[in-house]
């Protein structure tokens, strides 16, 4: 129950915290579970206990095993188990799954990758960062404190990121590396009551008899992928397909993503060879989603030829 997996590479420093944490200053005793042998507290030992921490400076493959920590109190001893595995260094670049820390996700707005377990170590900036074993270079990458910031994250930024730092113990330096996967996700979306950008409510659209006319219904529904969103035209409250006038057709426009990141849709109503009777119809631009429906009405009026010539 109070057990935690820890892993590291041979010849690197590994520091493990007792999974059964007490508060600072409580006495913590460490044992090697297989032999029940006490772990020494003297820092001259390669493996030694320091309060809640068990330090391997550096680690060896033979150190692998289960370690018991007991947080001592006269009325409430608490026992934890650290399952430690030390692996041989890989000769190739590939980092095996068993050496990977938890995957983190980032987006355009939040692209921090924290260096796993670094808070256990006595390290000084800067951290070195690698992606798929290549040192990260360029102004997009900024090593800041214990994390990496990537500017303008793109899907290509997904991959395995390794942080490398130096742990200092009494003047001696030990290397530590830790790797985790980074995935890029779309910014969290949201949905709003539809907002119709065009046409304006009760707009009068001037058309010329005998010519073609286009009406565009444009609405925005929120940010990111929308579960249900639609724009459409109605004629006198009837769907275009049911109205039965082949000269009047709607044609889906392109999905739009404006500079402010909103998810918007267009629907174009095409009227061929505008006739007098078309001026008597009520044209409704409808935008609907899970929040509800919004309607803007347009009427057609004949364009005055005099205005046209002027």
């Amino acid at each position: 129950k109070f057990s935690k997996q820890s892993w590291g590479l041979e010849n690197e420093a590994l520091i493990v915290r007792c999974p059964r944490q007490g508060k600072p200053s409580y006495t913590v005793d460490w044992y090697y579970s297989q032999t029940n042998k006490s772990i020494p507290t003297q820092e001259r030992n390669r493996v030694f206990a320091s309060g809640q921490l068990l330090k391997f400076l550096p680690a060896a493959v033979a150190d692998s095993g289960i370690y018991t920590c007991i947080v001592r109190s006269p009325t409430f001893n608490r026992t934890g188990y650290a399952n430690v595995t030390i692996y041989k260094k890989q000769s190739d670049c590939n980092v095996p799954d068993y050496l990977m820390y938890s995957t983190v996700s980032g987006s355009e707005k939040n692209s921090k990758i924290y260096c796993p377990t670094i808070d256990l170590y006595n390290w000084t900036a800067p951290l070195e960062w690698f992606k798929n074993c290549q040192a990260l270079q360029g102004s997009r990458y900024r090593a800041h404190k214990s994390f990496l910031v990537i500017d303008n994250v793109m899907t290509e930024d997904a991959g395995d990121y390794t942080c490398k730092f130096i742990h200092n113990e009494n003047g001696a330096n030990y290397s530590v590396t830790a790797t985790r996967s980074f995935t890029v996700k779309d910014e969290q979306g949201f949905s709003l009551f539809p907002v119709i950008g065009a046409p304006a409510q009760n707009e009068i659209k001037e058309v010329e008899i005998g010519k073609n006319a286009n009406l565009t219904c444009s609405a925005c529904f929120g940010k990111g992928t929308q579960f249900l969103a639609a724009v459409l035209w109605q004629l006198n409250g009837t769907k275009i397909t049911d109205f039965g006038e082949p000269r009047i057709q709607q044609e889906e426009g392109q999905n739009q993503s404006f500079s402010n990141g909103l998810a918007c849709l267009d629907m174009v109503l095409r009227i061929a060879d505008v006739k007098e009777e078309d001026l008597l119809l009520q044209y409704d631009c409808l935008a609907l989603n899970l929040h509800g429906l919004r309607r803007h009405t347009v009427r057609l009026s004949r364009k005055n030829p005099i205005d046209h010539h002027s």
Partner: antibody
Framework: DVQLQQSGPGLVKPSQSLSLTCTVT?????????WDWIRQFPGNKLEWMGY???????YYNPSLKSRISITRDTSKNQFFLQLNSVTTEDTATYYC??????????WGQGTSVTVSS | DIVLTQSPASLTVSLGQRATISCRAS??????????MHWYQQKPGQPPKLLIY???NLESGVPARFSGSGSGTDFTLNIHPVEEEDAATYYC?????????FGAGTKLELK
Amino acid sequence: DVQLQQSGPGLVKPSQSLSLTCTVTGYSITSDYAWDWIRQFPGNKLEWMGYIRYSGDTYYNPSLKSRISITRDTSKNQFFLQLNSVTTEDTATYYCATTMMDTMDYWGQGTSVTVSS
Amino acid sequence: DIVLTQSPASLTVSLGQRATISCRASKSVSTSGNSYMHWYQQKPGQPPKLLIYLASNLESGVPARFSGSGSGTDFTLNIHPVEEEDAATYYCQHSREFPLTFGAGTKLELK
């Protein structure tokens, strides 16, 4: 954050049993820690009554051992105090709390209990 | 049972001055390098709040003007400089053995 919410009657008749409930949110009572009952008498004296650990083990103040029972309902994340054969001397404000190591780190709001006929 | 005796029972201190509260145990509460004495603050209508654990360790979020010291049977809580919000009753508590017991409390008032 661990939060403890107390409930139970404010008035108990002498010789009857006092029963209080502490509902814990933000942490499972079977995960770790000890879950205490403490009372504060009208003169402000504090008395630790006992606790039930995450494992189900109970520890009671010997002064109350014959009358006290601390139990729990893990499905509701609640623990309970039952104090039998109460007298007017048991009039106090009763607190539930959690002991992480040796100290009571989180407390309930307190329930004032009067023993009177 | 270990009996904890607090003194004084009440204390009046001017703003900005030092308040010193003592707690004496009927037997040693120290063992294996730790002293199992803790301090709480209680304001009217509220439950006690942990200030200091293991005699001298400041609980997370508690202002640094609170400090604790002592070992064996004699322990002290110091508040310096005393602020208005420190008006409260202070209790010591041990955890050396069962049953856990509390001191009778020291009421701190401000001049």
